[in-house]
Interface confidence: low
């Protein structure tokens, strides 16, 4: 299938559906959006790479999201701009299919990454004592890989091989669209899988997160708390260290485990705590018990000299629990926005009903270490967490809904939607990739500072920026 055109029909003036000034405007706007998307997502990726304080599990999810969004900024946005401005697809069917496959796979991977982040937050808030243990780098890597593989399986084979499945390519030269979209059932199916289902899941998760946060805030207000020496407003963390050989105390009675050396806490075998970096905002609000554990890792925190390392005695019985409790006040560096927090670490081994026992122990210690109610500022940090997630969810819905609504309308009435409206709807999906770095990264003080250092070329000590 070759192009057959009248004399000079290949010239932009003849083929473009837009006037010259419109073409200039479209190129400027689209080019700027592409540039902002590229810069924003490169900044996120480089920040995570160069700053060791940003190398946390939740930021690995952000890194994956930034990869997807960067590809959209580099390829998808610019090729779609070219297609829109010229008025036809000039690069042939092979490049067309490759572009479509890349576009849809990566856009869907971006959505899947948003889903992972939502699930991660949901489990952090609803299972603060058990989930952080499972939340390892390996598990994060598996979840990220699953997001990409699932997106690839959902879109790439159908886009690339549909013409061979049905035995004919119905996409004309000079055009570039997904051939199987002429099938209404497939259109509905993919729209549900790629947008409607993720939106429903993310909305349900957000509802649970906000409900958990609200109920915790209420509990915090009601619950009477025991007095404690005035250290500072404290955020209590409960972390259960699941059995693995590294977690077992080296000495027989386990009393020496997790002692403080030179005022510093030794690194745990546990991955960093379960809060998204972007919640570490520029304020010193305290939060309620195990609302969301601090995002700071042990190597980011200076331990107070007076930190106590205690242990619960344990029997030598094979089925019994071996449990060490460490209570310590973690004092963040002055430029950190995370409230000072008390750590309660429950280091366990094997045995039945282990989690329940450990949770009870942790809860008792939590009550012991809580501040008097009158000294505690209102727990607004949880509201910030919820607000961040709401912003992310709304950004996703606002940018993706128009296109996906049009897709469904189009199934019944193809000419109903003007081409300009269609193009804007398609572009809005891309704009989600521009917004994502702002939504996530800019809510995090460490990210902000690292961005600033990178943009101002201040590379000295950038790896330790907090």
């Amino acid at each position: 299938m070759n192009n057959s055109t009248n004399s000079s029909n290949n010239s932009l003036a003849l083929t473009s559906p837009y006037k010259t000034f419109e073409v200039v405007f479209i190129v400027l706007v689209a080019g700027s959006l592409s540039l902002v998307t590229i810069i924003g997502n490169i900044l996120v990726m480089v920040s995570i790479k160069v700053n060791r304080h940003l190398q946390t599990v939740n930021n690995y999810f952000l890194f994956s999201l930034a990869c997807a969004d960067l590809i959209i900024g580099v390829f998808s946005m610019n090729l779609y701009t070219l297609y829109t401005v010229i008025g036809y697809w000039p690069l042939g069917p092979v490049v067309c299919d490759l572009w479509l496959a890349l576009d849809y796979v990566v856009s869907n991977a971006s959505v899947m990454n948003l889903l992972i982040i939502s699930f991660d937050r949901y489990f952090c808030v609803t299972k603060p004592l058990t989930y952080p243990v499972k939340r390892t780098t390996k598990m994060a890597g598996m979840m990220i890989a699953a997001a990409w593989v699932l997106s690839f399986i959902l879109w790439a084979p159908a886009i690339l091989f549909w013409q061979f499945i049905v035995g004919v390519r119905t996409v004309e030269d000079g055009e570039c669209y997904i051939q199987f979209f002429s099938n209404a059932a497939v259109t509905f199916g993919t729209a549900i899988a790629a947008f409607y289902l993720p939106v429903i899941i993310m909305t349900v998760l957000y509802w649970h997160i906000s409900r958990a946060s609200k109920s915790r805030i209420k509990k915090d207000k009601k619950e009477p708390v025991a007095n404690q020496d005035p250290v500072s407003p404290s955020l209590v963390q409960g972390r259960i260290v699941k059995p693995n050989n590294n977690n077992m105390p080296s000495s027989d009675d386990g009393l020496e485990h997790n002692k403080i050396q030179n005022g510093k806490a030794p690194r745990d075998p546990v991955t960093e705590n379960c809060v998204q970096g972007e919640e570490k905002e520029s304020s010193n609000d305290s939060t309620s018990v195990s609302a969301v554990a601090s995002n700071m890792r042990d190597d980011e925190i200076t331990q107070d000299e007076n930190t106590v390392s205690t242990s619960l005695g344990h029997s030598k019985d094979e089925n019994s629990k071996q449990t060490c409790i460490r209570i310590g006040t973690k004092t963040p560096k002055s430029d950190s926005c995370t409230p000072t927090n008390t750590t309660v670490e429950v280091v366990g081994s094997s045995g039945q009903n282990g989690d329940e026992k450990q949770n009870i122990v942790a809860r008792k210690i939590v009550k012991m270490t809580k501040q008097p109610a009158k000294k505690k500022p209102p727990p607004s940090r949880e509201k910030k967490v919820t607000r961040t997630i709401l912003a992310i969810l709304l950004a996703f819905i606002i940018t993706w809904a128009p296109y996906n609504v049009m897709v469904l309308i189009n199934t019944f009435c193809a000419p109903c939607i003007p081409n300009t409206v269609w193009t804007i709807g398609y572009w809005l999906c891309y704009i989600n990739s521009t917004i994502n770095p702002a939504c996530y990264a800019l809510c995090n003080a460490t990210f902000k500072k690292t961005f600033k250092h990178l943009l101002m070329c201040h590379y000295k000590n950038i790896g330790a920026t907090r």
Partner: nanobody, 115 residues
């Protein structure tokens, strides 16, 4: 709501000509592309020709040099001029805006080439 309606089909002898029209109930200026498709009995629907907003015309190899597509935005109509018709051109011809997902299909117009 813009609806597309095909017309101009009929019975013609091999080597003969027909002109198909695709009339829109609203403006076609906003449609990036309008294409003609055909479906022969027992076969998959195949693309025949398309014309983009700026007048860029493109054709399937099987009809190149014999068919001509044009659009008249003032009349909101797209035409397919078919010359040197062959027996294998017998099919139901449809017009559509194929650059959108889930394009719905009209009734089409029957073209029969028979000696």
């Amino acid at each position: 709501q813009v609806q597309l309606q095909e017309s101009g089909g009929g019975l013609v002898q091999p080597g003969g000509s027909l002109r198909l029209s695709c009339a829109a109930s609203g403006s076609i200026a906003n449609l990036n592309s309008v294409g003609w498709y055909r479906q022969a009995p027992g076969k998959e629907r195949e693309w025949v020709a398309a014309i983009l907003a700026g007048g860029f015309a493109t054709y399937a190899d099987s009809v190149k040099g014999r068919f001509t597509i044009s659009r008249d935005n003032a009349k909101n109509t797209v035409y397919l001029q078919m010359n040197s018709l062959k027996l294998e051109d017998t099919a139901v011809y449809y017009c559509n805006t194929p650059d959108r997902p889930g394009a719905s299909w009209g009734q089409g117009t029957q073209v029969t080439v028979s000696s």
